[in-house]
């Protein structure tokens, strides 16, 4: 007897969609093979229609899709635009066609929906619209016109042309009489409920002359399309609820027990503090259609989710609904990073960002989450030497360590680069991290003077002090360009007296600029690193007047200006315009990202999202 | 309020046949699961066969034990769930339920999915 289980018969109509669920003994291996669903042939083969691996049969091509749950054993096969030619015995299996790891499946497509016993059937979703069409004589056209719902054996009135509304429908229900060339009559129902289901009677005259048509209301709630991500991934629910909603407010709500579902995200401003941080709810277009993108996936983020359209922003009965079910894959592949990283004001961070290692040649992105309006993420850095003006030399996108994943070091740090941060690329999608940077209390630990001048065609030596802490990392100091910072020679100048308690393992690194030239005017970083993985970062600039006086110079801790709490930069420095991003597959969907470079560094709040993934500045 | 009411149980030697019925009054939504559970004196009750119906689509679902010999449909004008048992075993000797409930992604032969059930019906069969 094979193991695999499904359902035995599957019935529907031309035009509908069939989601037939098999399932599977969730053993390792079972979970890793090929899935398939084949048709079985009059002489015993099965021709396979689709499979995990990727195949579609021109059959289903842009209609099917095969989806493999491996933590609930079931594999779901989504076959849409059914027609009466896909009538037939099937298989769901696992391995080869010819194994017997399958189960049989028939599916009977039968004509319709239309005419059942002179009855019009209409199957229309939850909180759509239907408009039930009455068709009467000439000796009826002046006569009243009336629409009644069938209640058990007694039929009630819903609407009639004498102005009359049951109180169910009311705001929602209209009659309409077309011109005086067509015997027709409309009942047009909005924001359908299920409550509305039922047959129905349209009726023109009153006496034993009059005109009466049957109609069968089916309300459906829209079966929910399964979603399957990765643990610390990303989802992106896309909503389109049709051009008659596009004024009214969006929500996206996740189901909790019975009917309750709590408003993950709207458009009237309301989030759920779970989602800080870590969602977009992205403009919708003129058609009314929207998408809410989800980051750093948690186990405790599956189950059924809802996205509609009501005024109030959130699930009312007659709102029309789109409907996901999402499983979030523990065995991920994307790695754990720390997801909250700590640096001091004045100080640095290291952010390590993961990303499809298929992906290599993809662009690198950082942006700064907004939780303004519905959440944005305005781009600050990516790997292609563009770099937010606001942020030109202390912020920093290095490819390192590479192999799946790149690095971000962001420092001069102030209160009020508190916040979350998302590291993306123009590939994958699915690859979208969050981390959030917490400023504490505490003094940066490498020293370097604040502000530098250096003298034209002079030598200038710049000291940076590093603590013992660091006697086993590399040390170097480079300078900062749009696409990285670029390495120089240094020299070690033996201990530092900079700090109080610490041994000969500290120490005094220098940078010497020799022949001082315009082209030296700029930042520089001193820093530490291990291998390919970046610690501490402090910045200097370097500014470059005309000679005043001979000789070279050597600037100390004690001459050198503090550095302030903020750098603000001064028109001197080349504002980049708002670079568009180049790779249309980068978020089509997420304008609000590539469209808001420019804006202005904003005050932000950190919100502490609990995790136990921490890192501080300094660590790997 | 739904109701169902089952009938058409009875006594019957191994190998019979018999037609269970489940009147089904007051449902009203066009997406739902409906089934045919059974319970042997002293055992746990059991999914036997289930549909799962969502607008004019349906998926019919039975357990490995009534596969082949069991077979379960339903008659919207008439509101009515049956299930036709061929090749009656011993073993089948039960008391049937109709039950309804919420639309089901996947298979419906779990009980905590239905909310609405009847009395049920007696299946006796003797050898």
């Known amino acids: 007897k094979s193991p695999i289980f499904g359902p035995e018969e599957v019935n529907s109509v031309e035009g509908n969609s069939v989601s037939i669920t098999c399932y599977y003994p969730p053993t390792s291996v079972n979970r890793h093979t090929r899935k398939y669903w084949c048709r079985q042939g009059a002489r015993g083969g099965c021709i396979t229609l689709i499979s995990s691996e990727g195949y579609v049969s021109s059959k289903y091509a842009g209609r099917a899709n095969l989806t493999n749950f491996p933590e609930n054993g079931t594999f779901v096969v989504n076959i849409a635009q059914l027609s009466q030619d896909d009538s037939g015995r099937y298989k769901c299996g696992l391995g080869i066609n010819s194994r017997g790891l399958s189960f049989d499946v028939s599916l009977e497509v039968s004509q319709g929906p239309g005419l059942l016993n002179d009855t019009k059937v209409y199957t229309v979703d939850l909180g759509r619209t239907v408009t039930i069409n009455c068709p009467f004589k000439t000796e009826n056209a002046q006569k009243r016109k009336s629409l009644y719902k069938q209640i058990g054996l007694y039929p009630v009135l819903v609407i009639d042309s004498s102005g009359y509304v049951n109180p169910n429908y009311t705001g929602r229900i209209r009659l309409d009489i077309q011109g005086t060339g067509q015997l027709l009559f409309s009942v047009v129902i909005n924001q359908l409920r299920l409550s509305d289901a039922g047959q129905y009677l349209c009726q023109a005259g009153d006496d034993s002359n009059s005109n009466k048509k049957n109609a069968d209301l089916q309300v459906l709630k829209p079966e929910p399309e399964l979603v399957y991500e990765d643990l610390r991934g990303s989802v992106t629910f896309h909503c389109a609820l049709g051009p008659e909603v596009a004024n009214v407010a969006k929500f996206l709500c996740r189901q909790s027990s019975g009917e309750n579902c709590d408003v993950v995200v709207n458009t009237l401003g309301k989030r759920a503090p779970a989602f800080e941080g870590r969602i977009l709810l992205n403009p919708q277009d003129k058609d009314g259609s929207f998408s809410v993108v989800i980051t750093g996936l948690r186990k405790e983020d599956a189950g059924r989710y809802l996205c509609g359209a009501h005024s109030d922003g959130q699930l009312q009965e007659g709102s029309p609904i789109q409907a996901w079910q999402l499983f979030v894959n523990e065995e991920s592949t994307i790695p754990r990073s720390p997801t909250v990283v700590k640096g001091v004001a004045g100080g640095s961070v290291a952010v390590l960002c993961p990303y499809n290692r298929k992906e290599s040649k993809s662009i690198k992105y950082w942006c700064l989450w907004e939780g303004a309006q519905n959440g944005r993420c305005p781009l600050l850095v990516d790997s292609e030497g563009w770099v937010k003006a606001q942020y030109e030399g202390r912020l920093s996108l290095l490819e390192e360590p590479g192999n799946g994943t790149f690095t971000v070091i962001l420092n001069q740090l102030t209160s009020r680069d508190a916040g979350f941060y998302w590291c993306l690329t123009n590939g994958d999608t699915l690859w979208r991290t969050t981390v959030e940077i917490k400023i504490i209390e505490g003094e940066p630990n490498l020293k370097v003077p604040g502000n530098v001048t250096a003298v034209l065609g002079e030598t200038l030596k710049v000291p940076c002090h590093f603590p013992c802490k660091f006697s086993s990392y590399e040390k170097y100091w480079c300078k900062w360009n749009n696409t990285g910072c670029q390495a120089l020679p240094s020299q070690d100048e033996g201990p530092s007296k900079a700090f109080v308690n610490c041994d000969e393992n500290s120490r005094l690194v220098s940078l010497t600029l020799n022949l001082v030239t315009r082209a030296d005017e700029g930042w520089y970083w001193c820093g530490v690193k291990q291998g390919h993985f970046y610690g501490e970062t402090a910045a200097v600039y370097v500014a470059v007047e005309e000679r005043k006086a001979a000789g070279s110079r050597d600037v100390s801790l004690a001459k050198a200006d503090a550095a302030p709490d903020e750098k603000v930069l001064d028109s001197g420095f080349r504002e980049i315009e708002n670079k568009a991003i180049q790779d249309p597959r980068l978020f089509a969907e997420e304008k609000a990202v590539a469209d808001t470079r420019d804006q202005a560094d904003g005050s932000r709040a950190s919100v502490d999202s609990g995790s136990s993934e921490e890192q501080g500045g300094s660590s790997r | 309020q739904v109701q169902l009411v089952e009938s058409g149980g009875g006594s019957v030697q191994a190998g019979g046949s018999l037609r269970l019925s489940c009147q089904v009054s007051?449902?009203?939504?066009?997406?739902?699961?409906m089934g045919w559970f059974r319970q042997a004196r002293g055992k746990e009750r059991e999914g036997v066969a289930c549909?799962?119906?969502?607008?004019?689509?349906?998926?019919?679902w039975y357990d490995d034990s009534v596969k082949g010999r069991f077979a379960i449909s339903q008659d919207n004008t008439k509101n009515t769930l049956y299930l036709q048992m061929n090749s009656l075993k011993p073993e089948d000797t039960a008391m049937y339920y109709c039950?309804?409930?919420?639309?089901?992604?996947?298979?419906?032969?779990?009980?905590?999915?239905?909310?609405?059930w009847g009395r049920g019906t007696q299946v006796t069969v003797s050898s």
């Open positions: 007051g449902y009203t939504g066009s997406q739902h699961s």
């Open positions: 549909i799962n119906i969502n607008g004019m689509t349906s998926y019919k």
């Open positions: 039950a309804a409930g919420r639309y089901q992604l996947g298979h419906c032969l779990a009980l905590p999915a239905y909310t609405d």
